[in-house]
Interface confidence: low
């Protein structure tokens, strides 16, 4: 009968550069030994290797010496009592790609190089990109930790440094970056801006990194009224405080443009008198156009903004006059500065 | 702190060879490559190569290849460069500079001047 | 090798202006740029990293911007320490090559 030498392996595998790979693998091999039990000793080869004396890439042997650039990176995983040689391959480097045997070894009689079931190794190119995790949304002012890691990397070999680059990160001593970790507290102006993380695996020029525009949600900030009249002067009273009375002209024209900075955008409406605007006469934008006022059209406007992170709003009145007097001005129930023209 | 402490200047002979050193602190000196420059006087940077301390692994300019050999010395966490062969055209401020990645090149070291002159 | 060319050898300018070093490289580059600036005998001084990123405690009114083959180095307000030598350096490949160096002059 013919003794039974089996093995189970994928015939090639395919990793990228500074990444890991677990090879399943088993095997099997003759043994009727009813009186002795010798250990059972398993190696992989590089192919064209000559089991006797050359290095081996991984063993559970130790007494056989281990090529220095796959110790620690070729390693035998599972019990090989069990008949398991499956075989993890960390840090992968472009040199380790090329062909591997498979071999036993058990008292004198199971000496035997699986040579008709080789292992394929190919080393590609570092295209695998690092995953920045972070609970969403960011909220600006609070903490939120960052984290980075590179599918795909494990344990075997120099750890991965990892460096965080961002305008919202700034400034931040390189150490602070140098972590898997961030803890970043976000503020309004950091919305839209990149985020960066490069890992690096120690000692190798092997680097990848993956960028993400940050979502920072911000309540409404800056609100303002711009007053234009269409009189030809293109001339904007722009309103920054509540209880400006702003006198006009009978039959003038005016778009009243509500802004305001927030994320995500906030809802705006107008209100004359303390009552909603027709939506006709308002943009979703927030531009409330008043053509050819009437005299009884005046009174108090208010723009209202709706966010989940807070209300706000402004008023200004409006002072309808019926003289001819061509000149603009623009007083203020309270003491304080004259608005900005812009 | 991070810092990178230079050898003092040199004064050599043409044809004889120099060696400079650069001895880092404040950070894992095997984290990081130590990248060699050279600025003649009055003229820009050239990069003359650098040195991976981690594994010893050393990367040559092709224009200065044979020019310098780049060493470490893990135990005292020093970079060396060697340089062979001098000629005028040698003689120039070297500088060591730890590359941090995606930030360049954040900290120099003070220079060391080497003047090839008979 | 990429190229890294600095047109202007010198620029004057005067303090409390503001000034633009301009920096040209022969291939894309992305935004793997730093800046540096060397006063007459000194070491150089690491100001900018990527293209637009500062380094810490370099002052806010440099600043740079630019990506692929085109980056600028701008100093508003300029003061009368900033007279100095700026160079730009690409680090998106090796060698790693520095641009030939803008001598600032104050009026």
């Known amino acids: 009968e013919k003794p039974v030498y089996e093995l189970q392996v994928q015939k090639s595998v395919t990793v990228q550069e500074g990444l890991c790979v677990l090879v399943p693998c088993s095997f099997s091999y003759p043994w009727r030994s009813w009186y002795s039990s010798p250990p059972l000793y398993v190696y992989w080869f590089r192919d064209g290797e000559i089991p006797y004396y050359a290095e081996v890439v991984a063993t559970n042997n130790p007494d056989r010496r281990v090529k220095p650039e796959t110790q620690g990176r070729f390693r035998l995983l599972g019990d090989v009592q069990k008949k398991n040689c499956s075989l993890s391959i960390g840090d992968a480097r472009m040199e380790d790609t090329g062909s591997y045997f498979f071999r036993v070894e058990r008292g004198r009689d199971v000496k035997y190089s699986y040579q008709q079931n080789k292992l394929n190794l190919e080393v590609t190119a570092l295209i695998e990109k690092p995953d920045i995790h972070f609970l969403e949304p960011l909220e600006s002012g609070r903490p939120t930790r960052l984290s980075c890691s590179l599918p795909g990397s494990c344990e075997a070999g120099p750890p991965l440094t990892f460096s965080w680059t961002g305008n919202a990160l700034s400034p931040l001593d390189p150490e602070t970056t140098r972590s898997s970790e961030l803890t970043l507290t976000p503020r309004p102006e950091d919305h839209g801006t990149n985020l960066t993380c490069q890992v690096k695996r120690q000692g190798a020029q092997v680097t990848t990194e993956r960028t993400v525009q940050l979502n920072v949600s911000y309540a409404p900030q800056n609100l303002a009224i711009s007053i234009f009249f269409r009189n030809g002067t293109g001339t904007a009273l722009r309103i920054l405080s509540n209880g400006m009375s702003v006198p006009i002209q009978e039959g003038q024209s005016l778009f009243l443009a509500c802004t305001v900075d927030s994320n995500p955008p906030a809802s705006l409406s107008w209100f004359r008198e303390g009552k909603a605007l027709n939506p006709s006469q308002t943009s979703m934008s927030g531009t409330l156009e008043l053509p050819n006022i009437g005299a009884r059209e005046g009174g108090e406007f208010t723009c209202r903004v709706q966010h989940p992170l807070g209300s706000q709003h402004l008023s200004f009145i409006l002072s309808v006059q019926r003289s001819s007097s061509s000149c603009i001005c623009v007083t203020e129930k309270q003491q304080g500065s004259w608005p900005l023209l812009t | 702190e991070i810092q990178l402490q230079q050898s003092g200047p040199e004064l050599v002979k043409p044809g004889a060879s120099v060696k400079v050193s650069c001895k880092a602190s404040?950070?894992?000196?095997?984290?990081?490559?130590m990248y060699w420059v050279k600025q003649s006087h009055g003229k820009s940077l050239e990069c003359f190569g650098y040195i991976d301390p981690y594994n010893g692994g050393p990367y040559y300019n092709q224009k200065f290849k044979g020019k310098a050999t780049l060493t470490v010395d893990k135990s005292s966490s020093t970079a060396f460069m060697h340089l062979n062969s001098l000629t005028s055209e040698d003689s120039a401020v070297y500088y060591c500079a730890f590359y941090y990645g995606y930030y360049g090149v954040p900290y120099w070291g003070q220079g060391t001047l080497v003047t090839v002159s008979a | 090798d990429i190229v890294m060319t600095q047109s202007q050898k010198f620029m004057s300018t005067s303090v409390g202006d503001r000034v633009s070093v301009t920096c040209k490289a022969s291939h894309n580059v992305g935004t793997s740029v730093a800046w540096y600036q060397q006063k007459p005998g000194q070491s150089p001084k690491s100001l900018i990293y990527s293209a637009s990123y500062r380094y810490s405690g370099v002052p806010d009114r440099f600043t740079g911007s630019g990506s692929g083959t085109d980056f600028t180095l701008t100093i508003s307000n300029v003061q009368s320490e900033d007279l100095a030598e700026y160079f730009c350096q690409q680090y998106n490949s090796y060698p790693l090559t520095f641009g030939s160096g803008t001598k600032l002059e104050i009026k």
């Open positions: 404040g950070y894992s000196f095997t984290d990081y490559n």
